[in-house]
């Protein structure tokens, strides 16, 4: 019976996330596998989060709003792990714009989601950020390693959305 | 007073090359952001380039990528556009400006006289 | 890329009197509050000069008679007292976006 009603919960949870995303992929986790997380197809899934890169090419607000419609945020980028994750997705001779700017120019930079700007985890490319007039912030391969780099906003790349993972 | 002064252009046959200058004064040129505008005759502005201030990153629309290239001498405070494979289409006024971010955006502050640049054979 | 359309092709004003021009892009240029519509005015063999920044800013040394509103895809420029001086075309450009589009110009002449 209980098991019933806790299908009978999911089954509803997904009916009301289906009119948002279409298909999500969920596996089972927790200590006796009985949570249920997700994300939509085709994201990838790290630790607690859902990661969609988008290949469009827009410049960086239309791509936070087009993070944003699908109910997430330009990527903010925690750690290291994290972004060795994220890299594995991404093309070579390919920039993807980060939830990361500095609206102002003042070197204030800040991530989409407010989440602390900490100077100890970035992974900026050596003798970046090096423009004030470039306010946003791309993710490439350079000299062989991924890393950041600062950019003109307006100028469109692709760009990588990131978002809570569904729990069912 | 900021002054930009645009020089190199003239006539040339169609798939010739042309390299335009732009000398400034006035400004602490290597901080600056720097891009080209034209305007061909009758029509509207239309943007061909944006270089960074260090010089480092360059772009531009497809109408002229791979065509024209942008750089920058910021020891002789000169910016420079080399124009190769040229077209009809790319006779116009060809200016300089300063570029100013605005927040996400940015616009185009000060500008250069213009050198006219003709296409024809 | 972002169209940009003006309207009037061009205007005849009498002095003193107000001349509005039109500039109507082909999708939303704000993001967080801020529209990225700049307008310039250009006199005859001269280059663009800056009048007004994110819609509604007025360029430092830009007499105030000059005004900009507007958000979204609608953007308007105002001369709410035209002078002799202002004969000239009046382009709007929008820089949210590479590559930076402008309008085709809008000429305003003396009725």
């Known amino acids: 019976n209980f098991m019933y009603s806790k299908t009978v919960k999911r089954l509803s949870k997904l009916q009301e996330y289906q009119q948002y995303y279409p298909s999500l992929t969920c596996v089972m986790e927790g200590k006796d596998m009985e949570d249920w997380s997700c994300c939509p197809t085709p994201w990838t899934s790290f630790q607690s989060s859902c990661y969609f890169i988008s290949t469009v090419m827009q410049s960086w607000t239309k791509s936070q709003n087009n993070c944003s419609v699908m109910g997430a945020d330009l990527v903010v980028i925690n750690t290291k792990e994290e972004q060795d994750f994220i890299t594995q997705n991404l093309k070579i001779n390919s920039a993807y714009f980060l939830g990361l700017s500095d609206p102002k120019g003042w070197r204030h930079w800040q991530w989409v989601d407010q989440t602390p700007y900490n100077k100890n985890v970035t992974f900026w490319h050596s003798g970046e950020p090096n423009s004030p007039d470039e306010r946003c912030a791309i993710i490439n391969f350079r000299s062989e390693e991924w890393g950041w780099n600062d950019v003109h906003c307006h100028v469109p790349q692709k760009s990588i959305c990131k978002m809570k993972k569904i729990y069912i | 007073e900021v002054q930009l002064l645009e020089s190199g252009g003239g006539l040339v046959q169609p798939g010739g090359s042309l390299r335009l200058s732009c000398a400034a004064s006035?400004?602490?040129?290597?901080?600056?952001?720097m891009s080209w505008v034209r305007q061909a005759p009758g029509k509207r502005l239309e943007w061909v380039a944006t270089?960074?201030?260090?010089?480092?990153?360059?772009y531009y629309p497809d109408s002229v990528k791979g065509r024209f290239t942008i750089s920058r001498d910021n020891s002789k405070n000169t910016l420079y556009l080399q124009m190769n494979s040229l077209r009809a289409e790319d006779t116009a006024v060809y200016y300089c400006?300063?570029?100013?971010?605005?927040?996400?955006?940015?616009?185009?502050?000060?500008w250069g006289q213009g050198t006219t640049v003709t296409v024809s054979s | 890329d972002i169209v940009l359309t003006q309207s009037p092709d061009s205007l005849a004003v009498s002095l003193g009197e107000r001349a509005t021009i039109n500039c109507k892009a082909s999708?939303?240029?704000?993001?967080?509050?801020?529209?990225?519509v700049n307008w310039y005015q250009q006199k005859p063999g001269q280059p663009p000069k800056l009048l007004i920044y994110?819609?509604?800013n007025l360029e430092s040394g830009i007499p105030d008679r000059f005004s900009g509103s507007g958000s979204g895809t609608d953007f308007t420029l105002t001369i709410s007292s035209l002078q002799a001086e202002d004969v000239a075309v009046y382009y709007c450009?929008?820089?949210?976006?590479?590559?930076?589009?402008f309008g085709g110009g809008t000429k305003v002449e003396i009725k």
């Open positions: 400006a300063t570029y100013r971010p605005y927040y996400y955006g940015s616009v185009l502050d000060y």
């Open positions: 006035g400004i602490t040129f290597s901080t600056y952001t």
């Open positions: 270089i960074n201030s260090g010089g480092d990153n360059t």
């Open positions: 999708q939303s240029v704000d993001y967080d509050g801020n529209s990225y």
């Open positions: 994110g819609a509604s």
């Open positions: 450009q929008q820089s949210d976006e590479d590559p930076w589009t």
